[in-house]
């Protein structure tokens, strides 16, 4: 069985790599435009040059193409705490990231917000903060992990998950009280 190809893929597959089929004449293969440029005019005939023009400021193409327009440069989302790591060039989109001691939390595949890495106060760092993952903390005795922060077991309510983690602490308190009653 032949896999189903889209019209553009079908047209491109007729030509060798780095070339595309002329939209008005399927017997002509035109050379694709280099990254940083876009297609202004198709090649007039076989072996003749494709008219490619450089992308204007604020736009780019990151790979060889036969796009009629360059792509608009991305803008870093300040409201998400993003900062510009590298600015847009004709052949590369803007690279956005987070500040030092922050990590990216992806709200969707394409959208991230910067959050501060947890410091693991009253605990130790189990796994260091990564570009896309917060620090993983291990809490000291007498503390339990809640929302990636080490909270005192004195704040542990019976209904919360922490009862298991804080149980030895609770039993120790009871044991001390019991041993005092002779």
């Amino acid at each position: 069985l032949v896999p189903h190809l889209g019209d553009r893929e079908k047209r491109d597959s007729v030509c060798p790599q780095g070339k595309y089929i002329h939209p008005q004449n399927n017997s002509i293969c035109c050379t694709k435009c280099h990254k940083g440029t876009y297609l202004y005019n198709d090649c007039p005939g076989p072996g003749q040059d494709t008219d490619c023009r450089e992308c204007e400021s604020g736009s780019f193409t990151a790979s060889e193409n036969h796009l009629r327009h360059c792509l608009s440069c991305s803008k870093c989302r300040k409201e998400m705490g993003q900062v510009e790591i590298s600015s847009c060039t004709v052949d590369r989109d803007t690279v956005c990231g987070c500040r030092k001691n922050q990590y990216r939390h992806y709200w969707s595949e394409n959208l991230f917000q910067c959050f501060n890495c947890s410091l693991c106060l009253n605990g130790t760092v189990h796994l260091s903060c990564q570009e896309k993952q917060n620090t993983v903390c291990t809490c000291h005795a007498g503390f339990f992990l809640r929302e990636n922060e080490c909270v005192s077991c004195s704040n542990c309510k019976k209904s919360l998950e922490c009862t298991k983690l804080c149980l030895p602490q609770i039993e120790n308190v009871k044991g001390t009280e019991d041993s005092g009653t002779t």
């Epitope: 939390h105 709200w107 969707s108 595949e109 394409n110 959208l111 929302e147 990636n148």
Partner: nanobody, 122 residues
Framework: EVQLLESGGGLVQPGGSLRLSCAAS????????MAWVRQAPGKGLEWVSF????????YYADSVKGRFTISRDNSKNTLYLQMNSLRAEDTAVYYC???????????????WGQGTLVTVSS
């Protein structure tokens, strides 16, 4: 079939409060990030607030920071938006949306509710 059903909208005076709810079904609600998005009359969509699957991390638009609170109850498959100190400019249709996690093709949301109208007027 994924369904998101908003409720709690209505007419409220400036300075008043409302609590919106969104009942989710047809997917594992507790495994996904959720959002509130609004559209004011004659305007484009505006992100209001996001919340992660566990209800720990949140995002708020500058226009609602300190006034709105997003929360969720995974045991009830419900998303909430507590809106306090409401202003005329908060008048909009409020949509509950599921944030897209894969094969998004530049979309940030893959499912939407029908919306609930919030009108802030004296």
């Amino acid at each position: 079939e994924v369904q998101l059903l908003e409720s709690g909208g209505g007419l409220v005076q400036p300075g008043g409060s409302l609590r919106l709810s969104c009942a989710a079904s047809g997917f594992t609600f507790g495994g996904y990030r959720m959002a509130w998005v609004r559209q004011a009359p004659g305007k484009g969509l505006e992100w209001v607030s996001f919340i992660d699957s566990e209800g720990v991390l949140t995002y708020y638009a500058d226009s609602v920071k300190g006034r709105f609170t997003i929360s969720r109850d995974n045991s009830k498959n419900t998303l909430y938006l507590q809106m306090n100190s409401l202003r005329a400019e908060d008048t909009a249709v409020y949509y509950c949306a599921k944030l897209c996690s894969s094969n998004c093709n530049m979309r940030n949301f893959d499912y939407w509710g029908q919306g609930t109208l919030v009108t802030v007027s004296s």
